[in-house]
């Protein structure tokens, strides 16, 4: 999916109001410096691409993020503020239902959510000194 035509300001508002807090809740008890940066993004569509990938694509050692509160709110924000996003996710959602697993918070998942926090921060605050 090409995130170029999303309403970035509305997604930013959704992040600030709820998603950021859910990410913090998930990470509670973990030091912010515990994990090195292993993923980045260079513009807002790119950030959303990486955020979607880390949030919804199962990875080795962390297959359970999609059912977390922050993930469901991320999905809702993208569905509302990215034209045509919902349609592209129907097949992916059906496949995910088939392989749903018991929720387990592993260290790998904590690391992944730490990377997600970094991506969301970049999306929220583009790295330009003079806006």
């Amino acid at each position: 999916y090409d995130f170029t035509n999303c309403d970035f300001e509305k997604i930013k508002a959704a992040y600030l109001s709820t998603i950021s807090k859910d990410l913090i809740t998930y990470m509670s008890g973990t030091k912010s410096t515990e994990f090195n940066n292993t993923v980045s993004c260079s513009n807002r569509p790119h950030c959303l691409t990486e955020i979607q990938s880390l949030t919804f694509n199962p990875t080795a050692g962390c297959a359970s993020l999609a059912k977390e509160m922050f993930a469901m709110k991320t999905k809702a924000a993208l569905a509302i503020w990215c034209p045509g996003y919902s349609e592209t996710q129907i097949n992916a959602t059906q496949a995910m239902k088939k392989r749903r697993k018991r929720k387990v918070t592993t260290n790998k998942c904590l690391e992944q959510v730490s990377q997600l926090q970094g991506l969301w921060r970049r999306f929220n605050r583009p790295l330009l000194k003079q806006q």
């Epitope: 940066n37 980045s40 990486e50 790295l127």
Partner: antibody, heavy 126, light 106 residues
Amino acid sequence: QVQLVESGGGVVQPGRSLRLSCAASGFTFSSYGIHWVRQAPGKGLEWVAVISYDGSNKYYADSVKGRFTISRDNSKNTLYLQMNSLRAEDTAVYYCARGDSWNDRLNYYFYDMDVWGQGTTVTVSS
Amino acid sequence: SYELTQPPSVSVSPGQTASITCSGDKLGDKYACWYQQKPGQSPVLVIYQDNKRPSGIPERFSGSNSGNTATLTISGTQAMDEADYYCQAWDSSTVVFGGGTKLTVL
């Protein structure tokens, strides 16, 4: 762990070509811009080139423009530097470095380099 | 072309504060960062986005950037801080490094 490893350096005659490689591991290579930086013996750091995360934007130092080409293969987590028409002044240790970047609709901005390789030595001599 | 100017050398006594400057036209309008390089080693990022420290970099390293000058400050300098230091910024599609400053801990 997060790592960059350069290879391909060596001794080459003036006017000849060489291709350097930089293998990345421990991070999502395809999401970062990557630089080549060189350091001549006893001299300071000199930026050579940078490529954006998706390879769509490339920038070069004036001293290598038209002679060097930066490229990347995200499927192989590898960065390249094709060096043609080499000169004695290209003799240096060549580092690849992971860069922070941002682009708006008009411009690309490359900031700091937070991960560096160990370097590979290129000597141009007859 | 854009240039960043650093003093070739700075000396400091152990425990004292060392300041290394980096000058460039309207440098304060850009993000500056600093690298430390010890002999035979690759550079290490010590300050980014003017004043931020990467994880693992001691608190004694700090940075500032305004007007035409960025400054790297090392408070309570230790013998292990003896190294070459380079500032860097981005200008008009080009990465620019300063010429480097050799910090000597007396």
